[in-house]
């Protein structure tokens, strides 16, 4: 055993001076040699029979929510299904896991990335990566040309997740789409109305929504010379300038892609604007851009979803910004992304650089490619990065040392005196029976201090509290927790008065 | 059990050159790590070089690096130390040492020694 | 390089006493240190790696303690065959380097 335990102790020595070089950025080989030690170490250390045979933990990139995480992540929800429903969308749901075929094509390099099952009696079948590419399917395979759903539940991604950012291999997106034939432009700017609404209630801090499209970048490439077999890794590099420098992103564009100089100039020239419609009017005027009828289309449209966001009162928080170049493989028009101008970070605390938090555009092309006939549905759609959300929620609570009601109990029935589980247990029931969240201590005879003690931990506003005089008078006594303050209450009242109370509808409609 | 046993030791002039051996047995020889730790008259000890079991890694103490070289015969179960441009303060007891748990940096098992005398 | 600095030097003591003898490092180590046992015209003898590990076969009266910059080596009750040179070893980084020795001498 003691031999047994010093090689554990070499084992995590090594792992720590392993650790220790990739941080100081020590020689290839030194670090090559002392992992290879590290490996050596851990193979004479075999398997402990002693201890379990696998180490409890939740599979990478996955965790548990606790029910303070719960209590955060159901308030973001209803913020966000809320708004859903007030822009009059249904909701669907689909399974878990598709055919692979379904999922096959539709997301280019990132294919890579999808979860497959082993066989499962001859169906090949892959967890979804998203919600969209099944909402297309759904569209095609029950014919429908008109929906407006959403929907939320978890995806899967064979990502290396930083999960301290918000990122997970099993994460939720809430989605939102409109499909159908519309006139140009009035369901992309409810889109972007609905984003901005949710970002917005959910208080995360101040964002930008960043809008391209397609058809302009498209457009764009050609113009300044482009090949169309470049097309997409050169997107890649253009998408990079809201992290590094455009000397960089050249750098990288004739470096690495073979681009011609004076071609990633005349990229550079376009993709470092930004703007408002004032850039939309100045690109329809440049002679080269709107002479490309990709580029037009897409400009008069940008055009036109301006005005409509002016109306929607939320054109101060879109910028049109032409290096917006990311999730194209599907995308045929407009695309968006909401970006934090800056986390809310207290004193002292890092900012949690959780990049985007929601992202969307429109997609015309999808439902065709599962249609025998390739019939189209145009489509148009959103999707909030909860788990982003989630962490900074959870960080700003931390950081404010904020309570947060992880259950919603509106009254204990507590006793006073000895042998009163009988009556506790009817009171309960009754309120139950009346729509009252209400709770009582499994104990027989509970002293009063840790009934109210409990009450004070798990932030429950009333205690109902049953006593031999209060039964001879029929009354209960009702106690606020926070002002301590007791009143009588006629039995026959105690469920109307809890409900006005705790602002609760007095009946359950 | 395991064993190690220098040889080559003897007396050379400075400039001279010398090759000391260390026999092993007992042991998976190729597994190992094997160091050179070289110990002058009543004085302290030295780690002078050392190599790893697949014969990948090698290093040597500045005061030896450009005239020592370590190397191993894992068919032969044998260590060498080539010792060129010899100076008087090379003269030593050298051992040859078996890092413990193949690869951590600390003889576990040690040879008898071989003495170096390095005079004019 | 990493210096060890060992003290004392040298010490004085009868069978039956606790001896401690401390290693210093220039830098910190964390637990890569080991301690070494020599008798005149003999190879040392290795008594305790990363820093408490007793080396199998060694008496448990011989315990090791310490991480970072500061170790010990402690003979719990000292018996004759323990008369020697004590010397500890850094194992962090090449070139890996050795204290000055302690004599452990009878009083």
């Known amino acids: 055993m003691a031999e047994r335990a010093a090689l554990e102790e070499l084992v995590k020595l090594q792992g720590e001076r392993v650790r220790g070089l990739k941080q100081q950025k020590a020689s290839a080989e030194l670090i090559e040699e002392e992992v290879a030690k590290l490996l050596k170490l851990k193979a004479q250390l075999g398997p402990d029979e002693s201890k379990q045979k696998f180490v409890l933990k939740t599979p990478k990139g996955t965790r548990d929510y606790s029910p303070r995480q719960m209590a955060v992540r159901e308030k973001v929800f209803d913020v966000i299904i809320r708004c859903f429903k007030r822009h009059g969308a249904e909701v669907i749901d689909t399974p878990v896991f598709e055919l692979k075929e379904t999922l096959m094509g539709k997301y280019g390099e990132d294919s890579k990335l999808i979860y497959d099952l082993k066989d499962q009696g001859g169906e090949l079948l892959s967890l979804r990566y998203d919600l969209t590419v099944p909402f297309a399917r759904y569209l095609a395979m029950n014919k429908l040309t008109n929906i407006k759903r959403y929907h939320i539940a978890k995806v899967y991604r064979r990502d290396n997740p930083a999960m301290t950012r918000g990122r997970y291999r099993e994460f939720y997106q809430c989605d939102f789409d409109i499909a159908g034939n519309f006139d140009p432009m009035i369901p992309d700017a409810e889109c972007l109305k609905i984003m901005c609404e949710i970002l917005s209630s959910l208080q995360i801090g101040d964002f930008l929504v960043k809008v391209n499209d397609r058809r302009i970048l498209d457009g764009m490439f050609a113009i300044c010379g482009v090949s169309d077999s470049k097309f997409r890794t050169i997107c890649s590099s253009v998408d990079k300038l809201d992290k590094v420098s455009w000397e960089e992103v050249k750098n990288e564009m004739v470096g690495e892609k073979g681009l011609a100089p004076e071609v990633a100039d005349r990229i550079g020239d376009y993709v470092q604007q930004h703007g408002g419609v004032s850039l939309v009017e100045q690109l329809l005027q440049d002679p080269k851009l709107s002479q490309n009828k990709q580029a037009l289309e897409g400009l008069g449209d940008l055009k036109l979803l301006f005005e409509y966001l002016t109306l929607f009162g939320i054109d101060d928080k879109i910028s049109f910004d032409l290096s917006l170049a990311r999730g194209l493989d599907y995308y045929t028009g407009v695309i968006y992304e909401a970006v934090l101008l800056q986390t809310p970070a207290q004193a002292g605390e890092e900012p949690l650089g959780v990049g985007s938090v929601a992202a969307g555009g429109r997609y015309d092309g999808l439902v065709g490619m599962f249609d025998p006939k390739g019939r189209k549905v145009p489509c148009v759609g959103l999707s909030i990065g909860v788990e982003r959300i989630f962490s900074i929620v959870e960080q700003r609570l931390e950081a404010l040392e904020e309570k947060i009601r992880t259950t919603e109990t509106q009254v204990l029935v507590a006793s006073a005196q000895k042998k009163l589980l009988e009556e506790r247990l009817k009171l309960v029931s009754e309120l139950w029976d009346a729509g009252i969240k209400a709770e009582l201590l499994y104990k027989k005879n509970p002293k009063l201090l840790n009934q109210l003690q409990y009450c004070e931990e798990a932030g429950i506003p009333l205690v109902a509290i049953i006593g031999e005089q209060e039964l001879k008078d029929g009354v209960i006594k009702l106690r606020s927790v926070t002002s301590r303050e007791e009143v009588d209450v006629r039995r026959e009242d105690l469920v109307e008065e809890i409900k006005r109370r705790t602002g609760q509808p007095l009946c359950i409609c | 059990q395991v064993q190690l046993v220098e040889s080559g030791g003897g007396l050379v002039k400075p400039g001279g050159s010398l090759r000391l051996s260390c026999a092993a047995s007992g042991f998976t020889f190729s597994d190992y790590y094997m160091t050179w730790i070289r110990q002058a008259p009543g004085k302290g000890l030295e780690w002078v070089s050392y190599i790893s079991g697949s014969n990948a890694y090698t290093d040597y103490a500045d005061s030896v690096k450009g005239r020592f070289t370590i190397s191993r015969d894992n068919a032969k179960n044998s260590l060498y130390l080539q010792m060129n441009s010899l100076r008087d303060e090379d003269t030593a007891v050298y051992f040859c040492?078996?890092?413990?748990?193949?690869?951590?940096?600390?003889?576990?098992?040690w040879g008898q020694g071989t003495l170096v005398t390095v005079s004019s | 390089d990493i210096q060890m600095t060992q003290s004392p030097s040298s010490v004085s003591a009868s069978v039956g006493d606790r001896v401690t003898i401390t290693c210093r490092a220039s830098q910190g180590i964390s637990s890569w240190l080991a301690w070494y046992q020599q008798k005149p015209g003999r190879a040392p003898k290795l008594l305790i790696f990363a820093a408490s590990s007793l080396q199998s076969g060694v008496p448990s009266r011989f315990s090791g303690s310490g991480s970072g910059t500061h170790f010990t080596l402690t003979i719990s009750s000292l018996q004759p065959e323990d008369f020697a040179t004590y010397y500890c070893q850094q194992a962090k980084s090449f070139p890996y380097t050795f204290g000055q020795g302690t004599k452990l001498e009878i009083k």
């Open positions: 040492a078996r890092y413990v748990y193949q690869v951590v940096a600390i003889g576990d098992y």
